[in-house]
């Protein structure tokens, strides 16, 4: 199967990806363009204009300038200048600012909490199954199987720390060797990058926002996939990670450390533990073939227990199992002995919602999955709206310049490395790469951070999560200390190796180009984002898992032809773009293949057929929600609801159906300014539009 042609041009022809860019008008010369220099090479920019939007409220015929879709949008200040406000207006503006900050922090708090609950939900739904993946004996001999198990388990439990801790306990109890654990850790690294990709899907409403957000999220995925693609074979051939980490571990003089500091968890735990609490040991026990754990619930019921060591009479299979002959006796049938038994007495129940419901894990998991996704989505929308209203004009300029500008020459190259350190530091503070990268995603979407800057921040996040793991390892008990430290170090050096591969030389920053390519496709065909998610995080790993279970001959028999076809297609694609004359005329493009094999258009038509009936009801629902939101936020009455209906409305406009209101994020003052109707500042007027 040939690649989709859209992958080929990540940015050369932006007009191809901008909806409604049908007629280009001459560019007004007086418009100043905000250039955005990042630590990546500059990209040629094509300027062109969109047709004006017509509205019953106001007619805006201001010529619109559209740059390269990857250039950051100009966040215009639509509010009234501070100097033009009266005292009442100034006070109101300050209070609005404080209010917005409180709201932003509040939504950010619930956003992080919902990520935590989402992880718990995934563990309840797929945790036991994930645990059973580990009990597969083929992991030892098949690194590829280890890799996909790492991916699948982390995707199912939505937590790389859970899958890593299972691996640690398996290594500590000799069920797994460090050599066999390394591919699983690599897989866990890939699996953890799904969270911010899911978060990016929440920004599907706005094409340009979604393009940036999705690319910003998938840059993490591509970095991890590419790192594994290179480093797994290297590790299998040389075992460099195992050797290096073993040398480091052996040079340590161990002392059990303090517990790894819980920083963000201190704030979020009091809330999340009221929702649900899980007994994480159950998944580890299943992974370690503990039959009794299979019937245990993951939902924690008793939070306060008293463990007492007591001497208990227990039956044993034979006299050989007796602690001593004098401490053995019979009841006539069974042999009994006295053993020290730890007796667990339940004292106090947990204080979460599900403690008294006695629902099956799957039911609790599904309930929490729905709720957490709704909260996550709601918080994300509100964060984006608040940031959209705050980050305008001067504030936006300052923030964008601070984040995206390089150090002066000759130290420009250092900027990215500082970003890596910032990413690592921030991740260390929030104790989760998922939380950090998920918080980064909407910022990329709304255009505060460029993908070129988000990339090193994400790489730093990968490092940050491993330093947390190293600290946790140093605090672990004696029996697991060595194995947990070695695995944490393997994780650390894997990420360092990945950064050395895909960051220092701008030419090697393939993840950025790949993510942009995927961002372009996903902006044009939004269903492709979900398709990508399913294929890369579920279908491919599950297929490899199935083939691995069938044995090496089957895996090689299927894998080699597939890899050969992929390499052939990539080589052909490279030749087509670089030196097409070398190829025969027929191979200079993909037209020799059926359309469905080299274009997403036919697939789009099929999917549209299926999703068509759901678009109208969904849109109505969106409108109602948006109207309520507008009432609560005090948006202008004429605001168009909602962005997710944009395409539908564009379709209606094309058919001559008038659309009644301007964009949701457009501010009424812009429209008035366009008509020269700016009124005197009023205390009731918004600071900046929400």
């Amino acid at each position: 199967m040939a690649p989709w042609p859209e992958l080929g041009d990540a940015q050369p022809n932006p007009s191809k990806y901008l909806e409604g860019a049908t007629s280009q008008q001459p560019i007004t010369p007086d418009k100043s363009k905000e250039t955005n220099k990042t630590d990546n090479t500059e990209v040629p920019v094509t300027k062109f204009e969109l047709l004006p939007t017509y509205s019953t409220a106001t007619l805006i015929e201001e010529p619109t300038e559209v740059d390269d879709p990857w250039n950051l949008p100009t966040l215009q200040d639509s509010g009234i200048k501070w100097s033009e406000r009266d005292a009442k207006g100034k006070i109101l503006c300050v209070f609005q600012g404080i209010g917005r900050l409180i709201l932003l922090l509040g939504f950010l708090y619930f956003f992080v909490c919902s990520l935590d609950v989402l992880s718990s939900a995934f563990q309840l739904v797929g945790g036991k199954m994930a645990g059973q993946f580990f009990s597969n004996s083929s992991i030892m001999s098949n690194p590829l199987l280890g890799l996909v198990i790492g991916v699948l388990v982390t995707v199912f439990v939505q937590s790389s720390s859970t899958s890593t801790s299972i691996v640690v306990s398996m290594v500590a109890s000799s069920l797994l060797t460090v050599r066999a654990a390394i591919p699983i850790i690599m897989g866990a690294n890939i699996g953890t990058s799904i969270t911010n990709t899911i978060v990016a899907l929440m920004q599907v409403g706005d094409r340009s926002e979604f393009r940036r957000a999705f690319a910003g999220a998938t840059v993490h995925d591509f970095f991890n996939w590419l790192s594994v693609l290179v480093l797994l074979p290297v590790e299998v051939a040389t075992h460099y990670l195992e050797v290096v980490t073993q040398l480091i571990v052996e040079s340590f003089h161990f002392k059990n450390g303090e517990d790894a500091p819980d920083l963000l968890k201190v704030i979020t735990k009091p809330f999340t533990k009221l929702i649900v609490q899980l007994d994480k040991k159950v998944i580890s026990q299943i992974a370690m073939n503990d039959e009794t754990a299979k019937n245990k619930s993951l939902v924690k019921i008793w939070c306060k227990t008293f463990t007492n060591m007591t001497q208990m009479n227990v039956t044993v299979p034979s006299m050989a199992n007796c602690t001593s002959p004098s401490l053995c006796w019979t009841d006539g049938i069974q042999i009994w002995t006295m053993k020290n038994v730890t007796y667990k007495e339940n004292i106090a129940k947990c204080q979460h919602i599900f403690v008294n419901f006695h629902l099956p894990d799957l039911a609790v998991g599904i309930i929490l999955l729905i709720i957490s996704l709704l909260v996550l989505c709601g918080c994300l929308i509100m964060i984006v709206k608040i940031l959209g209203s705050v980050l305008k004009g001067q504030v936006a300029t300052v923030i964008k310049k601070t984040i995206n500008t390089d150090f002066p020459f000759p130290f420009a190259w250092l900027t990215g490395y500082l970003a890596i350190l910032v990413g690592a530091g921030m991740t260390f503070i929030v104790q989760s790469s998922s939380v950090f990268t998920s918080a980064l995603t909407p910022l990329i979407g709304i255009g505060v951070i460029t993908i070129e800057r988000a990339y090193p921040l994400t790489l730093g996040s990968n490092i940050g999560t491993t330093t947390t793991a190293i600290l946790a390892a140093l605090a672990s008990p004696g029996n697991t200390l060595r194995s947990s430290l070695q695995i944490a170090l393997c994780h650390f050096f894997f990420n360092i190796s990945g950064i050395l591969l895909w960051y220092p030389i701008p030419f090697t920053r393939l993840p950025i180009r790949m993510a942009k390519g995927l961002g372009n496709i996903s902006a044009k065909y939004r269903w492709f984002a979900i398709f990508y998610l399913i294929i890369f995080f579920f279908l491919i790993p599950l297929t490899v898992f199935g083939l691995s279970l069938a044995g090496w001959p089957v895996l090689v028999g299927v894998g080699v032809p597939v890899v050969f076809i992929i390499i052939l297609v990539l080589c052909l694609r490279l030749l087509q773009s670089r030196c097409p004359r070398v190829l025969p005329k027929k191979l200079q493009n993909w037209n020799f293949l059926p359309l469905c094999m080299h274009s997403l258009k036919p697939w789009d038509a099929v999917i549209s057929k299926f999703t068509g009936p759901f678009q109208m009801p969904c849109c109505c629902c969106c409108r109602v929600c948006c109207r309520v939101c507008c009432l609560l936020c005090g948006c202008p009455k004429c605001c168009r609801c909602s962005k997710c209906c944009q395409d539908l409305e564009e379709g209606q406009e094309a058919q001559g159906v008038p659309v009644k209101a301007p964009e949701t994020f457009d501010n009424i003052t812009i429209s008035r300014e366009a008509q020269g109707e700016v009124r005197a500042p009023d205390s009731k007027t918004e600071c900046t539009a929400l």
């Epitope: 006796w329 019979t330 009841d331 049938i333």
Partner: antibody, heavy 119, light 107 residues
Framework: QVQLVQSGAEVVKPGASVKMSCKTS????????MHWVKQAPGQGLEWIGA????????AYNQKFKGRATLTADKSTSTAYMELSSLRSEATAVYYC????????????WGQGTSVTVSS | DIQLTQSPSFLSASVGDRVTITCKAS??????VAWYQQKPGKAPKLLIY???TRHSGVPSRFSGSGSGTEFTLTISSLQPEDFATYYC?????????FGQGTKLEIK
């Protein structure tokens, strides 16, 4: 209160078989072992074997293996012992006794079943 | 099989006397020993288990001691109803075995 009531005395011919019962009440039949003990006239006590009514698991004194068969009926809370191929030395009083949970002491005993083997 | 040897086999005593019966095991049985009292024509009755623990309803004048291979049953002050045959039993291993018995008679 705990009671163990055994079946009446038996007089049997050599080579024949006898099946005696031990009906229990006052406790959960399936939780304790049921032991059987032989006492020949003017002699001491001799352990024959035990049964755990909960699972039907049995253990026998090697001396009686093949001659004694222990069974239990949970529905009637009754234990049975069948003695086969009887000889004159099998003449004795046979007691059923409840085993204390977790060890081999016998806390409650039946009144005994007298078996006389005579031609 | 573990053999239990009781001594004496016969014992004559008067009401109010302090009486001690000994039971020796052929190998270490820990404390897995019980003592029974049997009156003529009656079923045995449990007195002591775990070598020293008195069974419910057994008068305090009966006490047991010992561990390993030597055990004793002591009646601190003989009562008229105490004249009977006494058996020790081990339950350290199968088969369970009893001592040959000690017959306590009125002097």
């Amino acid at each position: 209160q705990v009671q163990l009531v055994q079946s009446g005395a038996e007089v049997v011919k050599p080579g024949a078989s006898v099946k005696m019962s031990c009906k229990t009440s006052g406790y959960t039949f399936t939780t304790n072992n049921m032991h059987w003990v032989k006492q020949a006239p003017g002699q001491g006590l001799e352990w024959i074997g035990a049964i755990y009514p909960g699972s039907g698991a049995t253990a026998y004194n090697q001396k009686f293996k093949g001659r004694a068969t222990l069974t239990a009926d949970k529905s009637t809370s009754t234990a049975y012992m069948e003695l086969s191929s009887l000889r004159s030395e099998a003449t004795a009083v046979y007691y059923c006794a409840r085993g204390m949970y977790g060890h081999g002491a016998m806390d409650y005993w039946g009144q005994g079943t007298s078996v006389t083997v005579s031609s | 099989d573990i053999q239990l040897t009781q001594s004496p086999s016969f014992l004559s005593a008067s009401v109010g006397d302090r009486v001690t019966i000994t039971c020796k095991a052929s190998q270490d049985v820990g404390t897995a020993v019980a003592w029974y009292q049997q009156k003529p024509g009656k079923a045995p009755k449990l007195l002591i288990y775990w070598a020293t623990t008195r069974h419910s309803g057994v008068p305090s004048r009966f006490s047991g001691s010992g561990s390993g291979t030597e055990f004793t049953l002591t009646i601190s002050s003989l009562q008229p109803e105490d004249f009977a045959t006494y058996y020790c039993q081990q339950y350290s291993s199968n088969p369970l075995t009893f001592g040959q018995g000690t017959k306590l008679e009125i002097k």
